[in-house]
């Protein structure tokens, strides 16, 4: 069964995404598995479905259970399961293991701690950050977008970090907290001006109209864990999120790989149902770090159809 674990605290907002993905135009139906009861879509309900998202605003311990999402895709309905557990708030400071998200590691040169699941919520900066339940204060700590940056990391910075933010739904505010462990590793490394491995500068990518196309932007930034390194795509000089074409999406998150000891990142641009107008766009792969920014441009061209039947 295609299932995903999700958890939250009572009286906080919890938003869960259907583990089965589909096009934005596909209808998604949600059910409470134990009773096969349909989850309403009306936002006046405390628990309601909104496309691929299931929203608990706020969550209650009794909401715990398995929820079924059915993506009404063509040909076959695709089924996913969200295993949701809502816990009572702890009176003491300790965050139990079952509430912890994945551990992240950092070093003197790279100390970014991402706030887990925040991309599912409608939140506004700044985030509040706590370490072992104490609010973080001092110039060494910087809340930047959805992550925390710690300057001059020391071994004493290891511990459990909690991010707290407000989710807004139709004018109502709901608190959300998420905790993950941070470990510090001693690392000898260096950073370079970004080197883009793919695509080649001014590359022409052949695509077929009506099919999907993937473009991968891949760059290396030095050795060891890097501080503030990123790769991203732009369309005609505009961020993907601002361009406003739902068929064209960046893959969520950046994959970090170490090839020959080098720290590299890649970002996949997915174009669904390629259209003629996509051939007119300029696709820019951008790689940036503290040294600067490098840009490689790609254009699409129509592929000459070839017979590939067996």
């Amino acid at each position: 069964k295609f299932s995903k674990q999700s958890w939250g605290l009572e009286n906080e907002a919890l938003i869960v995404r259907c583990p089965r993905q589909g096009k934005p135009s596909y209808t998604v139906d949600w059910y409470y598995s134990q009773t096969n009861k349909s989850i309403p879509t009306q936002e006046r309900n405390r628990v309601f479905a909104s496309g691929q998202l299931l929203k608990f605003l706020p969550a209650a311990v009794a909401d715990s259970g398995i929820y079924t999402c059915i993506v009404r895709s063509p040909t076959f309905n695709r089924t996913g399961y969200a295993n949701v557990t809502i816990y009572k708030k702890q009176s003491d400071c300790n965050v139990p293991d079952y509430l912890m998200y994945s551990t992240v590691s950092g070093s003197e040169k790279n100390s970014k701690i991402y706030c887990p699941t925040i991309d599912l919520y409608n939140w506004t900066a700044p985030l509040e950050w706590f370490k072992n339940c104490q609010a973080l204060q001092g110039s060494r700590y910087r809340a930047h977008k959805s992550f925390l940056v710690i300057d001059n990391v020391m071994t004493e910075d290891a511990g459990d970090y909690t991010c707290k933010f407000i989710h807004n739904e139709n004018g109502a505010n709901y608190s959300v907290t998420a905790t993950r462990s941070f470990t510090v590793k001693d690392e000898q490394g260096f950073s370079l001006f970004p080197v883009i491995g793919a695509p080649a500068q001014n590359e022409i990518k052949e695509v077929e109209i009506g099919k999907n196309a993937n473009l991968t932007c891949s760059a290396c930034f030095g050795k060891g864990t890097q501080f503030l390194a990123a790769v991203l795509w732009q369309l005609n000089g505009t961020k993907i999120t601002d361009f406003g074409e739902p068929r064209i999406q960046q893959e969520e998150g950046q994959n970090q790989s170490f090839s020959n000891g080098l720290a590299c990142l890649d970002m996949v641009l997915r174009i669904a149902d390629v259209k003629e107008e996509d051939l007119l766009l300029q696709y820019d792969c951008l790689a940036l770090n503290l040294h600067g920014l490098r840009r490689h441009t790609v254009r699409l061209s129509r592929k000459n159809p070839i017979d590939h039947h067996s």
């Epitope: 589909g22 596909y26 040909t75 009506g210 099919k211 590939h308």
Partner: antibody, heavy 121, light 111 residues
Framework: EVQLVESGGGLVQPGGSLRLSCAAS????????MYWVRQATGKGLEWVSA???????YYPGSVKGRFTISRENAKNSLYLQMNSLRVGDTAVYYC???????????????WGQGTTVTVSS | DIVMTQSPLSLPVTPGEPASISCRSG???????????LDWYLQKPGQSPQLLIY???NRASGVPDRFSGSGSGTDFTLKISRVEAEDVGVYYC????????FGQGTRLEIK
């Protein structure tokens, strides 16, 4: 070259079992939905089963409970386990490639050469 | 199940002449994503089926441009602008909106 090759067909008695295999090559097998389609001699095409990229399976009523489709991505292989076979299951069985991992659809664009299953006493 | 009905069942054509096959579905094949989930396949004598048209009107890779698909909802047409000898075989329409069902097939033969 993108290719699908079926095997495992043969003669079997009614009530018997048979396991068909389909070896895929030339594409990322794990990223595609896969299908079995059959064709009785002189008849039309009939969809038999499908399996999506996460292993969920789909069947028409005529074979549900008797046939089981499965896949082994590490071996680029698709299987059809056929139990409680009936004379009416006699046909050429084709495996075919369907849409890709993000539900884009562009038909069954690759077909194998087929393997013959004969159910007779 | 969605029933697919093709006509004619047999189609004798003179080479160089156009040909047209109709396919009617028991319910609309138009999905909320804006596409008609209707394919056309050709099975040449002694061969496996091959995809010609997907999503109603999109020609598959390697398919000559004399083949075209049209229609929406419940009525679809496959047209061959100039029939060639190699086009002989059985043509099937197939719906992929709700599971999969094929039409009964149209046999195209050369006069």
């Amino acid at each position: 070259e993108v290719q699908l090759v079926e095997s495992g067909g043969g003669l079997v008695q009614p009530g018997g079992s048979l396991r068909l295999s389909c070896a895929a090559s030339g594409f990322t097998f794990s990223s595609y939905d896969m299908y079995w389609v059959r064709q009785a001699t002189g008849k039309g095409l009939e969809w038999v089963s499908a399996i999506d990229t996460v292993g969920d399976t789909y069947y028409p009523g005529s074979v549900k409970g008797r046939f089981t489709i499965s896949r082994e991505n590490a071996k680029n292989s698709l299987y059809l386990q056929m139990n409680s076979l009936r004379v009416g299951d006699t046909a050429v069985y084709y495996c075919a490639r369907g849409g890709d991992y993000d539900y884009s659809y562009y038909g069954m664009d690759v077909w194998g050469q087929g393997t013959t299953v004969t159910v007779s006493s | 199940d969605i029933v697919m009905t093709q006509s004619p069942l047999s189609l004798p054509v003179t080479p160089g002449e156009p040909a047209s096959i109709s396919c009617r579905s028991g319910q609309s094949l138009l999905h909320s994503d804006g596409y008609n989930y209707l394919d056309w396949y050709l099975q040449k004598p002694g061969q496996s089926p091959q995809l010609l048209i997907y999503l109603g009107s999109n020609r598959a890779s390697g398919v000559p441009d004399r083949f075209s698909g049209s229609g929406s909802g419940t009525d679809f047409t496959l047209k061959i602008s100039r029939v060639e000898a190699e086009d002989v075989g059985v043509y099937y329409c197939m719906q992929a909106l709700q599971t999969i069902t094929f039409g009964q097939g149209t046999r195209l033969e050369i006069k």
